[in-house]
Interface confidence: medium
């Protein structure tokens, strides 16, 4: 599923991401935009042999199990395919674990490069939340 901007903002808010670990909803929507272009089925392969999955491009070396990433830790204890569902529950639950891990949203390269220090509130402007 490819979410609309406000549709995703509402779903993320419903799942408790607004101000989770101090990160406003706009940060999460911005991250999803530049990680996956709001596409729940996005997959991208990395040079280390791991793959990123879903709307928040969660990595198979650390967070989920895709059965083929050497040394996978699967810290979210889920199959990576669960992160590709049109229901973003699994992605959100795993993202909460990631953002609580010490580096905050710096774990997402796209957030660091495209969202951090910008007017992230623009990503939820005009949305009825």
């Amino acid at each position: 599923k490819v979410f609309g901007r406000c549709e995703l903002a509402a779903a993320m808010k419903r799942h408790g991401l607004d101000n989770y670990r101090g990160y406003s909803l706009g940060n999460w929507v911005c991250a999803a935009k530049f990680e996956s272009n709001f596409n729940t089925q996005a997959t991208n392969r990395n040079t280390d042999g791991s793959t990123d999955y879903g709307i928040l491009q969660i990595n198979s070396r650390w967070w989920c199990n895709d059965g083929r990433t050497p040394g996978s830790r699967n810290l979210c204890n889920i199959p990576c395919s669960a992160l590709l569902s049109s229901d973003i529950t699994a992605s959100v639950n795993c993202a909460k674990k990631i953002v609580s891990d010490g580096n905050g949203m710096n774990a997402w390269v796209a957030w660091r490069n495209r969202c951090k220090g910008t007017d992230v509130q623009a990503w939820i402007r005009g949305c009825r939340l």
């Epitope: 997959t43 040079t47 059965g67 083929r68 050497p70 199959p79 590709l84």
Partner: antibody, heavy 115, light 107 residues
Framework: QVQLQESGAEVMKPGASVKISCKAT????????IEWVKQRPGHGLEWIGE????????YYNEKFKGKATFTADTSSNTAYMQLSSLTSEDSAVYYC?????????WGQGTTLTVS | DIELTQSPATLSVTPGDSVSLSCRAS??????LHWYQQKSHESPRLLIK???QLMSGIPSRFSGSGSGTDFTLSINSVETEDFGMYFC?????????FGGGTKLEIK
């Protein structure tokens, strides 16, 4: 137990298309990548590409882009590979395998003859 | 693409001999190297994954070693059932690639 059952041998004319199937049983089909591998005598094994059935995400070896197309039907736990514009170079045995980085589970192979 | 070169192309041995098969990668692939055995008209069978991890049901006479670019499959005291083709495969990067194979035949 995990099994991958491929469709039977095919004899096709040059220029035609063929669709090979791979039915998976014994595991959660949507969770694992299905890989496709080509084997020609004297050419060893070649990785064609892969599909993640749960999402339809696909990756192709550059060499096979435009030649192979992968699809999957999660209702029947079956992956498909269509090969188009067939030539004699496409005559080979085609295998599906479960993509665990390495390939522990293989189909029995589908022999394609183009002539 | 990572190229895998296997040597020798053919190895003629007598049952009871011990042999080593080589697989060399064109660039470092860490330990992401797997070995397969294939007999005529059969699908490949995974023997060893990640350089040295013997798969369940594979006899202990098979072992693997190496890292980076140079890898070896060893068979300690070859048995008649071991004759066939052996392939290496890397999963360090895409596209996945296989070696050209080593044919193990009876002398």
């Amino acid at each position: 137990q995990v099994q991958l059952q491929e469709s039977g041998a095919e004899v096709m004319k040059p220029g035609a298309s063929v669709k090979i199937s791979c039915k998976a049983t014994g595991y959660t089909f949507t969770t694992y990548w299905i890989e496709w591998v080509k084997q020609r005598p004297g050419h060893g094994l070649e990785w064609i590409g892969e599909i993640l059935p749960g999402s339809g995400s696909t990756y192709y070896n550059e060499k096979f882009k435009g030649k192979a197309t992968f699809t999957a039907d999660t209702s029947s736990n079956t992956a498909y590979m269509q090969l188009s514009s067939l030539t004699s170079e496409d005559s080979a045995v085609y295998y599906c395998a479960r993509g665990d980085g390495n390939y522990y589970y293989w189909g029995q192979g589908t022999t394609l003859t183009v002539s | 693409d990572i190229e895998l070169t296997q040597s020798p192309a053919t190895l003629s041995v007598t049952p009871g001999d011990s042999v080593s098969l080589s697989c060399r990668a064109s660039q470092s692939i860490s330990n992401n190297l797997h070995w397969y055995q294939q007999k005529s008209h059969e699908s490949p069978r995974l023997l060893i994954k990640y350089t040295s991890q013997l798969m369940s049901g594979i006899p202990s006479r098979f072992s693997g070693s190496g890292s980076g670019t140079d890898f070896t499959l060893s068979i300690n005291s070859v048995e008649t059932e071991d004759f066939g083709m052996y392939f290496c495969q890397q999963s360090n990067s895409w596209p996945r690639t296989f070696g050209g194979g080593t044919k193990l035949e009876i002398k």
